[in-house]
């Protein structure tokens, strides 16, 4: 059998291999050692017994899409049946105190490979034997601790394969300089050690994409915006646009990246070298946002100019074109640059929102019959922008971290946007008060520290007001969860 018979549904063409030469990979026309690595078709009954205690699942992931020329990394993780794990020696053991369908196991080992390899079966002292080889006959590399690696992974794509000895997780990186653009298929077959041979335990495939467009994502955030994911934002407040470039192999690390913005509001083009930009829309409406990212990246060198035409000579010295699939344009020691572009487009809606909220006065409410430990305090609040429909207060400890009480209620406010919010405080002391005004699209927050005196008529209320920070909230049955807007990871240059 050949590798393509074992690993794929269809024999790939030489054309595919010639046009996608992967460094360090081999042609799948090579012979596969079926004695050492048996081949089972899908549905073969032997799969049922290929692993003690159930089936092993292989999970294949990649950091696709990959910009052509960059490296793409594939990771395979083996997921063992319940209660099984790989130990430090590479053996498969039962987890302590873990109960599966078979109950608790008396034998700690699912597979004790250390014991097998110590039974050195006529090796020649170098650790090399006829069975410490890959399916194509190449010997295992003898890294330190290689004997604890009991799985053989065979990766297959574009008519080529790559073999790797590993533990329950392996990683393979491939340079995409010579890979055809578009979606491609990676297939992986996994074998486990079985005495002096190997047994297939899992097969998995995944599509990856090679592109000549820089993969670009943009996060948009705005203070007081209630829902940052609905692409609806508020007028007269800056929106922060943050560009994230998907470049996991850092191919563009040494590239100068330019960001060209068109915000769709007739403010013209804005060019920047910063991945973050702020823009304020001053009109309501729907706007088309366009971003073009440009980077000078390492790329293929243009072919040299063709030689002057000459009459053909009947000479056998010219090999067929296919002998050199890289052609003249891939001279390896040349260091050429090529402009790469990425594009992002979004339609965003700009609406009125609550722009600002301020507590202008705090008053201790004198009660005719004062409660033993309770104080009522009125907060006089003003706002700018649209008219709020609800008010929420969160009363917490002085650090503003431990919530003691949270209340939301609808409000009916006039055009002046002046309202009084009354809240009860249990006992004297210093409290942090977060007060939020909200409508359908916006939330505006202000915070203040107040000191509630003992119920001694001589004492007075003290307040330290702090400005309106922008927190997003989620209302859920009178419970308010606060989370910061700005938690994104960036590709910095």
């Amino acid at each position: 059998k050949r590798f393509h018979d074992v690993l794929g549904n269809e024999r790939p063409s030489a054309y595919m291999r010639e046009h996608n030469q992967l460094n360090g990979w081999s042609s799948d026309e090579n012979d596969w050692n079926e004695k050492l690595y048996p081949v089972w078709k899908r549905g073969d009954m032997r799969w049922k017994n290929s692993w003690k205690g159930g089936r092993v699942q292989a999970v294949l992931t990649s950091d696709s899409p990959a910009l052509v020329g960059s490296n793409i990394t594939f990771v395979v993780n083996l997921v063992f049946p319940r209660c099984q794990k790989e130990d430090a020696n590479g053996n498969i053991v039962y987890e302590k105190n873990c109960r599966n369908e078979a109950g608790l196991s008396a034998d700690p080992y699912v597979y004790n490979w250390t014991a097998w390899s110590e039974d050195s079966d006529g090796e020649n002292g170098t650790g090399q034997s006829h069975h410490n080889v890959f399916p194509d006959g190449k010997p295992f590399p003898h890294h330190p601790g290689w004997r604890r690696w009991n799985f053989v992974y065979v990766f297959h794509t574009l008519g080529q394969y790559f073999q790797k000895l590993g533990r329950c997780s392996v990683r393979v990186s491939v340079n995409t300089a010579n890979v055809t653009l578009g979606p491609q298929l990676m297939e992986v077959t996994v074998y486990r050690r079985h005495g002096r041979a190997y047994v297939p335990i899992a097969q998995v495939k995944d599509v990856y994409v090679v592109t000549d467009q820089i993969p670009v994502f943009v996060t948009m955030s705005q203070k007081n915006d209630r829902n940052s994911s609905d692409e609806t934002f508020l007028k007269d407040l800056p929106i922060t646009f943050d560009v994230l470039i998907h470049d996991p192999s850092h191919f563009l690390n040494y590239s100068t990246i330019n960001y060209k913005w068109s915000f769709g509001d007739n403010t013209g083009l804005f060019v920047s070298i910063n991945h973050t930009v702020n823009h304020t829309y001053v009109l309501n409406g729907t706007f088309s946002l366009n971003l073009t990212v440009k980077a000078a990246a390492p790329g293929p060198c243009p072919p040299p100019p063709p030689p002057p035409p000459r009459p053909p000579k009947p000479t056998p010295s010219l090999g067929p074109a296919g002998d050199n699939p890289l052609g003249l344009s891939e001279i390896p020691d040349e260091n050429c640059q090529i402009n790469r572009y990425g594009h992002f487009q979004a339609t965003i809606t700009i609406v009125e929102g609550i722009l600002e909220v301020n507590i202008i006065q705090t008053t201790d409410v004198l009660m005719l019959v004062p409660g033993p430990d309770s104080s009522l305090i009125d907060f006089v609040v003003t706002c700018q922008g649209s008219i709020p429909t609800e008010v929420c207060t969160i009363i917490s400890d002085p650090t503003c971290e431990i919530t003691q009480n949270a209340v939301c209620s609808p409000v009916d406010v006039d055009e002046m946007c002046l309202l009084t919010v009354r809240r009860a405080f249990n006992g004297s002391g210093t409290y942090c008060v977060n007060l939020t005004l909200g409508d359908d699209t916006s939330l505006a927050l202000t915070s203040t520290l107040i000191s509630v005196p003992d119920r001694d008529p001589a004492s007075s209320l003290r307040m330290a007001n702090s400005g309106g920070g922008g927190l997003n909230d989620i209302f859920e049955a009178q419970k308010i969860e606060w989370h910061e807007h700005h938690h994104h990871h960036h590709h910095h240059h």
């Epitope: 269809e10 030489a14 054309y15 055809t180 890289l326 003249l328």
Partner: antibody, heavy 119, light 107 residues
Framework: QVQLVQSGAEVKKPGASVKVSCKAS????????MHWVRQAPGQGLEWMGE????????NYAQKFQGRVTMTVDKSTSTVYMELSSLRSEDTAVYYC????????????WGQGTLVTVSS | DIVMTQSPDSLAVSLGERATINCKTS??????LAWYQQKPGQPPKLLIY???KRYTGVPDRFSGSGSGTDFTLTISSLQAEDVAVYYC?????????FGGGTKVEIK
């Protein structure tokens, strides 16, 4: 939809050169190899070579090596095929054809350009 | 180079009858073989790729089969619009090569 539009018919004298163009639209130009296939009157199809618009790598059939040059203008999504030292047996319809990913079968063809070589 | 030998050179079949065209390659190209239909004054049109996969929009009376070095295009029930020249092409390796063509006519 994918379209390949070729330049018009040409009449050339023996020894001259001809440059045929093929303008692509309806797809990402740099993602697919472009091939040139010719057909002499009443004859079969003959593959001449291919070019990758992304990096301008080329592969030519041995028969045409040294006489054919394929080039690309990315700004106009156009591929060119220049054949030099023309002789009467080069009289043919020249087609550009787009391959599909890693597969060298041709779902999309230009309309063809007739090149007549005559003294 | 892979040599493609198509047979017969021409074929006359009654309407509604089966037409069979053969293509033999000088080496194993399986399954990298395509079939095209060409009518006068037009570029070729892809019918079958990878030996047996029908291209989008191609009527199901066209089918491809074969492996290794022997391949067949079958038109199960010939229609008037099927009168054309049919070519096989190996897409296994460079240089790509075509068969000499089979002219299909109505008897």
């Amino acid at each position: 939809q994918v379209q390949l539009v070729q330049s018009g018919a040409e009449v050339k004298k023996p020894g001259a050169s001809v440059k045929v163009s093929c303008k692509a639209s309806g797809y990402t130009f740099t993602s697919y190899w472009m091939h040139w296939v010719r057909q002499a009157p009443g004859q079969g199809l003959e593959w001449m070579g291919e070019i990758n618009p992304y990096d301008q790598r080329t592969n030519y059939a041995q028969k045409f090596q040294g006489r054919v040059t394929m080039t690309v203008d990315k700004s106009t999504s156009t591929v060119y095929m220049e054949l030099s030292s023309l002789r009467s047996e080069d009289t043919a319809v020249y087609y550009c054809a787009r391959s599909t990913g890693n597969y060298a079968w041709f779902a999309y063809w230009g309309q063809g350009t007739l090149v007549t070589v005559s003294s | 180079d892979i040599v493609m030998t198509q047979s017969p050179d021409s074929l006359a079949v009654s309407l509604g009858e089966r037409a069979t065209i053969n293509c033999k390659t000088s080496q194993d190209v399986s399954p990298s073989l395509a079939w095209y239909q060409q009518k006068p004054g037009q570029p070729p049109k892809l019918l079958i790729y990878s030996a047996s996969k029908r291209y989008t929009g191609v009527p199901d009376r066209f089918s491809g089969s074969g492996s290794g070095t022997d391949f067949t295009l079958t038109i199960s029930s010939l229609q008037a619009e099927d009168v054309a020249v049919y070519y096989c092409q190996q897409h296994y390796s460079i240089p790509l090569t075509f068969g000499g063509g089979t002219k299909v006519e109505i008897k």
